[in-house]
Amino acid sequence: WTGDCSHVSNQVVLLDTTTVMGELGWKTYPLNGWDAITEMDEHNRPIHTYQVCNVMEPNQNNWLRTNWISRDAAQKIYVEMKFTLRDCNSIPWVLGTCKETFNLYYIESDESHGTKFKPSQYIKIDTIAADESFTQMDLGDRILKLNTEIREVGPIERKGFYLAFQDIGACIALVSVRVFYKKCPFTVRNLAMFPDTIPRVDSSSLVEVRGSCVKSAEERDTPKLYCGADGDWLVPLGRCICSTGYEEIEGSCHACRPGFYKAFAGNTKCSKCPPHSSTYVEATSVCHCEKGYFRAEKDPPSMACTRPPSAPRNVAFNINETALILEWSPPSDTGGRKDLTYSVICKKCGLDTTQCEDCGGGLRFIPRHTGLINNSVVVLDFVSHVNYTFEIEAMNGVSELSISPKPFTAITVTTDHDAPSLIGMMRKDWASQNSLALSWQAPAFSNGAILDYEIKYYEKEHEQLTYSSTRSKAPSVIVTGLKPATTYIFHIRVRTATGYSGYSQKFEFETGDETSDMAAEQGQILV
């Protein structure tokens, strides 16, 4: 009998009479004992039964022996018998000789005995009686009440065995015999595969089985399961996790689809490629940046690819006898990063701006000239009457990865000591809800005609967030478009042909509210 897996996954069937197509061909002894009778079920399929009803005569001893059954990998064997047993009370005139039990025997052997049959050598497993539980089975037009009994045999040590059924005077139909052993079936738990495993004969001890990770998975902790006597897997320990580029779907690791990635081993899902990155292949651990975009060494794979910033904007300077202050606005495009820094490169140029040379080490930059995080730098120790060209570069964490030249904005400063001095005191001539009229003292020294004044102002409450500026040719101005009852900060610089002065100190003025009269006052100097 060749074993095959039944519908119960933890059973390996060695014999199932309901699946045998031809005659069973079991041995009966004596000849007028058990009878092979083929019934038909409701689907017109043959059911091979053995029947005996020798209830008239006493001292019955009718034997039925199976063919040789290979034990396969089993040690403990289970025998499931389905039978119908007639109640002796239904044949009242045979009460002395009628029995309601039969006996199950077995014998181990390494090979088939052929037709040789010696009942005396067989070992009794048990006496089988009908219990109160029945299952119903359709046999053609008849519904049969079937008893099911299961018995254990083992340990079996030889290659195979025979079963034998002894009738001692019952009226019985043996409708099916199923012989099987239990195994813990191949299973996948926590992404680890565990092979078919035969339980120990000793039902109190478990078999420890080490699992192997499914394809594209790796061990996190050594995966183990324990195989119990009934073919059940118990006590899962450890696990496997899907490798980079793979995600768990229904117990196996599947490659991330194009456009998705997974950077780390684990049981997380694949993620969509972050902005400005893509992948066109499966099982990607990191998405590749689009042209012109980069990923810094310490950027996690989940971060969007970024690019170098554009050039700084609105570069301006203030100069006096000893210091030159360069200021600028951040670039319009930061490249998608926050780690923005600036570098200032100084060049000395002649009249021909193509003839420039490095400024050398004579200049001092406060706080420094590279890696600046603020939008200004102070330049000291410059030489008079020189054209300095300052290139202000914006950089971020991926600037070094780009082969494109770094974007910069340049400003040229002429270091004339003839630059105008600062204006004197500033005052408010009048104020309305939306306007301020301001005037100030012209600078004591201007070295030439004053071309105009640049007035820079902003709300005190929003200092340096945004500012406005206006120009005036006279030392007075009316600033309009202001908010009522709001304090503004003003500072002014002078422009002559030789350049700008530095900015004045800051003056503070307030617009009127709805009830105030126009009033004049001295400006409050802010230190």
Epitope: C53, V55, T84, L85, I91
Partner: antibody, heavy 121, light 106 residues
């Protein structure tokens, strides 16, 4: 081949007795009970009873007690039906039939050819 | 004693037709019922036992069903050799026969 052989027709006077033999062959006689069935001319079947061929213990149906006796001679695998004090209404064909017991039910699966007993003065 | 009543007393059918015979018990006999066929001048022949199990050698055009008190014998397509008298018999308590149903050619 399994068969039951009965004797030929009998003509008896009222008050007489008759013994109808039924010889079995082709099977173990003591493994099956033997039943007796009567069929009056133009009538249906009437079960008379049976005998346990192993123990010789007879069971009689209602209306067949007293004058009717079932007996055996197992040495020659033969069952007998004896009717005493015959009456005209005993005129009938008498069949012996083997009782087959199975787990699914019982039936008389092998029949003798019948013996016609005629009671007439 | 248990009385078995068969109906109809006579059933006229043509060969190839279906014949359905009924047997009703005066009290439950479970599945302890047999059917016999008897042709003129012959001994009866066992067709069915256990209410629905065909005896050895009986063609599958004969089928039977029922339990308790109501039983049916069906001949799916009547053959010429099937014209005979049919008896039901119970063995639930003592044994009794029904009075018979004659199946004749229409």
């Amino acid at each position: 081949q399994v068969q039951l052989l009965q004797s030929g027709a009998e003509v008896k006077k009222p008050g007489a007795s008759v013994k109808v033999p039924c010889k079995a062959s082709g099977y173990t006689f003591t493994s099956y009970a033997m039943s007796w069935v009567r069929q009056a001319p133009g009538q249906g079947l009437e079960w008379m009873g049976w005998i346990n061929t192993n123990t010789g213990n007879p069971t009689y149906a209602q209306g067949f007690t007293g004058r009717f006796v079932f007996s055996l001679d197992t040495s020659v695998s033969t069952a007998y039906l004896q009717i005493s004090s015959l009456k005209a209404e005993d005129t009938a064909v008498y069949y012996c039939a083997r009782v087959r017991l199975t787990v699914y039910g019982d039936g008389m699966d092998v029949w003798g050819q019948g013996t016609l007993v005629t009671v007439s003065s | 004693e248990i009385v078995l009543t068969q109906s109809p007393a006579t059933l006229s059918v043509s060969p190839g037709e279906r014949a359905t015979l009924s047997c009703r018990a005066s009290q439950s006999v479970s599945s302890n019922l047999a059917w016999y066929q008897q042709k003129p001048g012959q001994a009866p022949r066992l067709l069915i036992y256990g209410a629905s199990t065909r005896a050895t050698g009986i063609p599958d055009r004969f089928s039977a069903s029922g339990s308790g008190t109501d039983f049916t014998l069906t001949i799916s397509r009547v053959e010429p050799e099937d014209f005979a008298v049919y008896y039901c018999q119970q063995y639930g308590s003592s044994w009794t026969f029904g009075q018979g149903t004659k199946v004749e050619i229409k």
